[in-house]
């Protein structure tokens, strides 16, 4: 592709919808951040499309990203992180849309991972822990916690809780015996920076005891 | 119609410490980057530090780092620097600006003289 496009081509763009949206990662690969952009309508004709972002970036005036699928991306260390960039859809020369963003406020949190409940019997309740890579990172370090879960059977019937640490208890008595249950957790930036829920991690799937006949307690 | 007000320049001896402020009144302050630079006697205007909106991200000119430290306090609408062991060459009036704009900043101040002697 050779990126630009014919007169006609170029009448027929403009009469396009080329909003997107966009989001940062940052140190999501040692020290390098990324952004990711897409357009929101996903039947857009992307040939000879392409993004490019200009201003507070170091030691480059501007950078284009690269296409991977229906998605555009950067992966890079060259982001300021101060002040405003602006992130335009571009045919050629010509630029079709453009948006001004500071990147520390479209930032979205990598998933959680390793997340698990342990049931302990004398306490009866469970322990929910889970783990985020951004304990160890410099900047997006404080967020808040979604854990969600239901019972297996109640399809759209998730109980959340918000949380900032990585830890959360649930009662055994708030939850019904002998059930399968699914959880799963996701972050979004609460201090400092601003931007939206990561994914979803991988839910984990635990059961509660049956109810002890003779007390009235779960087993 | 004044929007971004330093103060707290003057004159100090080499090795001291000086703290400067820049009060502005533009409403978009909370969500603004903001800078400070000087320009030395003769000399163009020279970027020294700048701090993104939250103040979590810093960023700092060669020249200072180690020994100035950019801050703000948004509650306030004010950006802080304070600049430690101070040196002839740091003699200069400090402006300080504010949104950073696609590599433009859109706001200055009047600046605050510092001298520093030895």
């Known amino acids: 592709e050779s990126g630009y496009a014919q007169n006609g081509d170029l009448e027929d763009a403009e009469l396009d919808d080329y909003s997107f949206s966009c989001y940062s990662q940052l140190e999501v690969n040692g020290s390098q951040h990324s952004l990711t952009c897409a357009f929101e309508d996903p039947d857009v004709n992307t040939t000879n499309l392409e993004f490019e972002i200009c201003g507070a970036l170091v030691e480059v005036k501007c950078l284009n990203f690269r296409k991977l699928q229906e998605i555009y991306f950067i992966e890079t260390k060259k982001f300021l992180l101060i002040g405003k960039s602006n992130i335009c859809v571009k045919v050629g020369e010509k630029s079709l849309t453009c948006k001004k963003i500071d990147l520390t406020t479209i930032v979205k949190p990598e998933a959680p991972f390793d997340l698990s409940v342990i049931y302990r019997e004398g306490a009866n309740d469970f322990v929910v822990t889970f783990n985020t890579s951004h304990l160890q990172k410099k900047y997006v370090k404080v967020l808040m916690h979604d854990v969600a879960y239901r019972q297996e059977k109640d399809e759209n019937k998730w109980t959340h809780v918000n949380l900032s640490s990585t830890k959360l208890t649930l009662l055994q008595r708030k939850l019904q015996p002998a059930a399968m249950y699914e959880i799963k957790v996701r972050s979004i930036p609460d201090h400092y920076f601003k931007g939206f829920w990561s994914e979803w991690s991988p839910s984990y799937y635990f059961r509660t005891p049956e109810i002890n006949n003779s007390s009235g307690e779960m087993d | 119609e004044v929007q971004l007000v330093e103060s707290g320049g003057g004159l100090v001896q080499a090795g001291g410490s000086l703290r400067l402020s820049c009060e502005s009144s533009?409403?978009?302050?909370?969500?603004?980057?903001m800078g400070w630079f000087r320009q030395a006697p003769g000399k163009g205007r020279e970027f020294l530090a700048a701090?993104?909106?939250?103040?979590?991200?810093?960023h700092y000119s060669d020249s200072v780092q180690g020994r100035f430290t950019i801050s703000r306090d948004n509650a306030k609408n004010t950006v802080y620097l304070q600049m430690n062991s101070l040196k002839s060459e740091d003699t200069g009036r400090y402006y300080c600006?504010?949104?950073?704009?696609?590599?433009?900043?859109?706001?200055w101040g009047q600046g605050t003289q510092v001298t520093v002697s030895s």
């Open positions: 533009i409403s978009t302050f909370s969500s603004d980057a």
């Open positions: 600006a504010e949104d950073y704009d696609t590599d433009v900043w859109q706001y």
């Open positions: 701090i993104g909106w939250s103040g979590a991200v810093t």
